[in-house]
């Protein structure tokens, strides 16, 4: 079957890292400088992706595989095979068109990518709020007042104190 | 080409459940932030519930908090909406859309650039 | 209530302009983009504008979108029948944790 598929067309005997040359009487040629395939029984070769810029080189180009690139520090990776390159914040901070703006207040981030998320809310769990939130963390919640044993008290603190500029909007 | 087809609406009785799929073709679907967006009868656009890439951060408008779940499948391309405890309120056309390619960003802030054809949910007795 | 506030209705002939105006606070409109969005009755909205400014390939330059603080406006020139639609302003609200729409304005071309 391969003899008769190489009978029928010659390129597919071509390796990756090779082309199937048109202007040779399609022999199989390697792949020029800075491009690639990365299959078989290609008629041309890919150009590599530079990694320029914002962005970093993960891995090198070779004449089988593209390069592969990631960002510089302080920026982290969007999309598929890291098509864009965005902004860190610090943790309790999100990425606004105005730049890194601390979470609002009710919400927090303990990532430096992403957006503020809300505190979880203890009580839809019937359970009570242990420790308070911050913008960088989470509340943690504990024992619902129910579960505590008697003559135990609920360790629910008061409300926290609005920090500056994080007042309800 | 890059589309997103809706199944799953219906006519459902008060206090009753519903799941809506959104499957998706045509662009990187792990890499997209996904929302519902619902307009009920001779209203306007209401967003429902948001979710990230990777699947790991869900948000919700306070009108379904506790009673609808957002979830997606990336090996099937599919996003979902899980609804319960559902009221006439509920009622509307409810949409999916792709909110761009990037993967921690924002739910709305690039746009939602492609919809699913809207499919209808029907709450009554 | 929404809490991105739109008017209700706008109109102008054929060939005009049209601006649509969309205020919301500093949590949504003031601090994170907008998009605009354009509703033929029946079907799915369409993306006009995202980040604040930007057109999708395939939507003429006859849609712009600007802000200023916490308003965006959307600017239709040259108004053709076709572009008579509803048009929805959306935001991401940070205090909210929520995504946000205006309550939609109805474009009539005279």
């Known amino acids: 079957f391969e003899r008769t598929r190489s009978l029928q067309d010659p390129c597919s005997n071509c390796p990756a890292g090779t082309f199937c040359d048109n202007n040779r009487n399609q022999i199989c040629s390697p792949c020029p400088p800075n491009s690639f395939s990365s299959a078989g029984g290609q008629r041309t070769c890919d150009i590599c992706r530079q990694c320029k810029g914002v962005f970093r080189t993960r891995k090198e180009c070779s004449s089988t595989s593209n390069a592969e690139c990631d960002c510089t520090p302080g920026f982290h990776c969007l999309g598929a095979g890291c098509s864009m390159c965005e902004q860190d914040c610090k943790q309790g901070q999100e990425l606004t068109k105005k730049g890194c703006k601390d979470c609002c207040f009710g919400t927090f981030n303990d990532q430096k990518r992403g957006i503020c998320r809300p505190w979880t809310n203890c009580s839809l769990d019937g359970k009570s709020v242990l420790v308070n939130g911050t913008k960088e963390r989470d509340v943690v919640c504990g024992p619902s007042p129910a579960d505590l044993s008697p003559g135990a008290s609920s360790v629910t603190p008061p409300a926290p104190a609005r920090e500056p500029g994080h007042s309800p909007q | 080409q890059v589309q997103l087809v809706q199944s799953g609406g219906g006519l459902v009785q008060p206090g009753g459940s519903l799941r809506l799929s959104c499957a998706a073709s045509?662009?990187?679907?792990?890499?997209?932030?996904m929302s519902w967006v619902r307009q009920a009868p001779g209203k306007g656009l209401e967003w429902v519930s948001g979710?990230?890439?990777?699947?790991?951060?869900?948000y919700y408008a306070d009108s379904v908090k506790g009673r609808f779940t957002i979830s997606r499948d990336n090996s099937k391309n599919t996003l979902y909406l899980h609804m319960n405890s559902l009221t006439a309120e509920d009622t509307a056309v409810y949409y999916c859309?792709?909110?761009?390619?990037?993967?921690?960003?924002?739910?709305?802030?690039?746009?939602?650039?492609?919809w699913g054809q809207g499919t209808t949910v029907t709450v009554s007795s | 209530q929404s809490v991105v506030t739109q008017p209700p209705s706008v109109s102008a002939a054929p060939g005009h302009k049209v601006t649509i105006s969309c205020s919301g606070n500093?949590?949504?409109?003031?601090?994170?983009?907008v998009s605009w969005y354009q509703q033929v009755p029946g079907t799915a909205p369409k993306l006009l504008i995202y980040?604040?400014?930007k057109r999708p390939s395939g939507i003429p330059d006859r849609f712009s979108g600007s802000t200023s603080g916490a308003s965006a406006t959307l600017v239709i020139t040259g108004l053709q029948t076709g572009d008579e639609a509803d048009y929805y302003c959306?935001?991401?609200?940070?205090?909210?944790?929520?995504?946000?729409f205006g309550g939609g304005t109805k474009l009539t071309v005279l």
């Open positions: 859309a792709s909110g761009g390619n990037y993967g921690s960003g924002t739910i709305v802030s690039h746009g939602m650039d492609v």
């Open positions: 980040d604040d400014n």
């Open positions: 979710i990230s890439g990777s699947g790991d951060s869900a």
């Open positions: 045509g662009f990187t679907f792990s890499s997209s932030a």
């Open positions: 500093s949590s949504n409109v003031g601090r994170n983009y």
């Open positions: 959306g935001a991401w609200d940070s205090s909210l944790s929520a995504g946000v």
